[in-house]
């Protein structure tokens, strides 16, 4: 077995992608390794080559089919193996049974756009990408707005506890540049985690009308 300094972590995007990270202290950077996926009730299997992302970690994406195809369900179990080449042979480094819908991480929301902007408020919409129809409306969102002179980490989180693909930002400052991001998470899954943040959407509030108190 592999020692305790090794980690093998994978997430399913709910459609046709399993992303994996394998880390092992002391492993050689030029070692050739791959992840092999064997579903328990499917006729296909899939392999991806682990590529270095840092000194001691490697990552790859198991592409299971067309981006919007539903390749796995809530009853599937996928056996994932890390294999590394040792001379002419492949050595199994780790074996994990993986329940896809217990390990969800969706793609970042896309198509962010300003629907309407005023001096003090802005209405923004977005879309979810490659999300399973199984979720129906069982999704939640987090959003954050970057104000001038602040960092993303300082931005307060706004939580939307339902599948609502829009937000109305209030109490904004007139004639000010802002940026906005959103992320999504299904409600189900033991290890389900937030998607990456969306690409930031830049917008500017309208200037206050001269001589008027707005």
């Amino acid at each position: 077995a592999v020692n305790g300094t090794s980690q093998f972590t994978c997430f399913y995007n709910s459609r046709a992608n399993i992303s994996c990270v394998w880390s092992q202290d002391g492993a050689l950077q030029d070692t050739s390794c791959q992840v092999h996926a064997w579903p328990d009730r499917r006729r296909w299997n899939q392999t991806c080559e682990l590529l270095p992302v840092s000194q001691a970690s490697w990552a790859c994406n198991l592409i299971l089919g067309a981006p919007d195809s539903q390749k796995l369900t809530t009853v599937d179990i996928v056996t994932l193996r890390v294999l590394c080449r040792e001379g002419v042979r492949w050595r199994v480094m780790a074996i994990q049974d993986f329940k896809p819908f217990e390990n969800l991480r969706l793609m970042a929301p896309i198509s962010l756009q300003v629907v309407h902007v005023e001096t003090h408020r802005c209405n923004i919409s977005w879309e979810i990408s490659q999300a399973s129809h199984y979720f129906e409306r069982h999704l939640e969102f987090e959003a954050r707005t970057l104000s001038p002179g602040h960092t993303w980490e300082e931005a307060p989180l706004l939580t939307l506890k339902q599948k609502q693909e829009w937000i109305c930002l209030e109490t904004l400052t007139p004639d000010t540049q802002y940026e906005f991001q959103v992320r999504v998470k299904p409600l189900q899954g033991e290890f389900t985690t937030w998607s990456p943040w969306s690409q930031p959407l830049a917008f500017r509030t309208k200037p206050a009308a001269l001589g008027k108190d707005t």
Partner: nanobody
């Protein structure tokens, strides 16, 4: 805390199958990660498999070669070890264990990570 009782061991011919069960009582089963270990005569206790509290991830020893499947039923307070294509080298006492601390299912735990142990069940594979 939970008490663990294993069952399902016995004598089986090489190539055969066994299903071990580990029944938990006296605690909240779903708050424990569960593991299986084995100890052959004259050898150290060896990790076999470990599953997370909800069963979303399960790690297996490389030595199992994909022949074993660990699963849990939180409604029945039971964890299972299905062993197929058994070999004489699988002969050992098999122990069920519970871990009170959080287990992510992304690494191989050590026996010292587990706090509660069953009494074991003997598995003998004849050639």
């Amino acid at each position: 805390e939970v008490q663990l009782v294993e069952s399902g061991g016995g004598l089986v011919q090489a190539g055969g199958s066994l299903r071990l069960s580990c029944a938990a009582s006296g605690g909240t089963f779903s708050s424990y990660a569960m593991g299986w270990f084995r100890q052959a005569p004259g050898k150290e206790r060896e990790f076999v498999a470990a599953t997370t509290r909800g069963g979303g991830r399960t790690m297996y020893a490389v030595s199992t070669e994909g022949r074993f499947t660990c699963s849990r039923d939180n409604a029945k307070n039971t964890v299972y070890l299905q062993m197929n294509s058994l070999k004489p080298k699988d002969t050992a006492i098999y122990y069920c264990a519970a871990m009170t601390s959080y287990y992510s299912g992304t690494y191989y735990p050590d026996s010292s990570d587990f706090d509660i142990w069953g009494q074991g069940t003997q598995v003998t594979v004849s050639s």
